[in-house]
């Protein structure tokens, strides 16, 4: 898909005026709770606070230049980045002896792109090279999409860095959530 060529490290991300984009919460990778490895206890209790803060699947506006090798778009393009969390924690403590592990209390949802839009951009190249016209695919909206435990790693790339759910037939053992994600329990709107 041609548009991916423009979403490279050379892309310049410029926050729009008045926008203070914050990165998405760190989604755990390789932090799945494992009773044997972790003694059944997460390093902290993710449900200590009753505080509720506004935090949900939202669309952050970014302005960036599209680049292709040495060429750069004449004007920046504005696109959305999907950020945030879908709903309250759907993990509940489950006592195992004196320890605790975590189990789901609902489906796992992720804030991901919903619709895309195509935009034609003109790329200016150095050295008198002729301008190039390119079509880029930009995120137009976000949604809270269900992530199943049957998604494999390649499918998960589209959902962000999230550990795969257990395979079919095995009991799900959800990961403990990061301290950052659980500083305050979340109130959301979908």
């Amino acid at each position: 898909q041609g548009w991916q060529a423009f979403k490279n490290d050379a892309t310049e991300i410029i926050p729009e005026l008045g926008e203070y984009p914050e990165p998405p919460p760190e989604l755990e990778n390789n932090k799945t709770m494992n009773r044997a490895e972790n003694g059944g206890r997460p390093p902290h209790h993710p449900f200590e606070t009753k505080d509720v803060s506004e935090y949900s699947c939202r669309e952050l506006h970014f302005t960036r230049y599209v680049t292709d090798g040495p060429c750069r778009s004449a004007k920046p393009v504005t696109e959305l980045v999907c950020s945030g969390q879908c709903g309250p924690a759907r993990l509940l403590p489950n006592a195992i002896g004196r320890g605790k592990w975590w189990r789901p209390s609902g489906p796992d949802f992720r804030c991901i792109p919903d619709r895309y839009r195509a935009q034609r951009v003109q790329l200016l190249c150095p050295g008198g090279e002729a301008p190039r016209a390119r079509k880029v695919r930009l995120v137009a909206s976000c949604k809270c999409k269900r992530l199943t435990r049957f998604h494999n790693q390649s499918e998960l790339k589209d959902f962000g860095t999230e550990a795969a759910r257990p395979q079919k037939g095995r009991k799900p053992r959800p990961r403990a959530r990061s301290a950052k994600a659980n500083q305050a329990e979340l109130e959301n709107a979908y």
Epitope: C57, S105, P172
Partner: antibody, heavy 123, light 107 residues
Framework: EVQLVQSGAEVKKPGASVKVSCKAS????????MHWVREAPGQGLEWMGE????????GYNQKFKGRVTMTTDTSTSTAYMELRSLRSDDTAVYYC????????????????WGQGTTVTVSS | DIQMTQSPSSLSASVGDRVTITCRAS??????LNWYQKKPGKAPKLLIY???RLLSGVPSRFSGSGSGTDFTLTISSLQPEDFATYYC?????????FGGGTKVEIK
């Protein structure tokens, strides 16, 4: 027997608030997030949101954002749904519902429902 | 939000009839489709989850099929207690949404 028992019918004036309760029994209350669904006259079912009884964290349907608050009292195994700034189109039967889980298919569904609470908004 | 469109909105049938209700999602919802039966003055009752899984205790005359965007609930031989309104519900994308309902009436 797993049961959800809701509070009685309410009649409210436009602009007022209503708080509906849902008392759970027959299962461990903190083991399940509680959901709220409403049915307006002549309309279908509409999902309002959910709450995690352990943390008090809630997630709401955008349609009700700012007007609805869901809370729980774990000591009495009771969930509450408060709807503010009531309008005539909020006249509906409000249900609490629990999510059940099928591990084989990794699927969730509303398996236990309260009997419903009729809220009438009228001047 | 994902729109769930049920058809027909109502139908008249006789005891013993085979009844088919369809539910269409505005986008792909995989197999995350549940069916509920609702009678006047009563709470909804789950019949089928994950498109075709029959909840324990639900009569085998109820069956579900489909995937993606098109789903079907079939009652193979309508019984007197089956006259009710049936709702589909998607569980793939938040907010959860329900179909408008199909009322099954006695002919």
């Amino acid at each position: 027997e797993v049961q959800l028992v809701q509070s009685g019918a309410e009649v409210k004036k436009p602009g007022a608030s209503v708080k509906v309760s849902c008392k759970a029994s027959g299962y461990t209350f903190t083991d399940y997030n509680m959901h709220w669904v409403r049915e307006a006259p002549g309309q279908g079912l509409e999902w309002m949101g959910e709450i995690n009884p352990n943390s008090g964290g809630a997630g709401y349907n955008q349609k009700f954002k700012g007007r609805v608050t869901m809370t729980t009292d774990t000591s009495t195994s009771t969930a509450y749904m408060e709807l503010r700034s009531l309008r005539s189109d909020d006249t509906a039967v409000y249900y609490c519902a629990r999510l059940g889980y099928d591990d084989i298919y990794d699927d969730w569904y509303f398996d236990v429902w309260g009997q419903g609470t009729t809220v009438t908004v009228s001047s | 939000d994902i729109q769930m469109t049920q058809s027909p909105s109502s139908l008249s049938a006789s005891v013993g009839d085979r009844v088919t209700i369809t539910c269409r999602a505005s986008q792909d919802i995989s197999n995350y489709l549940n069916w509920y039966q609702k009678k006047p003055g009563k709470a909804p009752k789950l019949l089928i989850y994950y498109t075709s899984r029959l909840l324990s205790g639900v009569p085998s005359r109820f069956s579900g099929s489909g995937s993606g965007t098109d789903f079907t609930l079939t009652i193979s031989s309508l019984q007197p207690e089956d006259f009710a309104t049936y709702y589909c519900q998607q569980g793939d994308t938040l907010p959860y949404t329900f179909g408008g309902g199909t009322k099954v009436e006695i002919k």
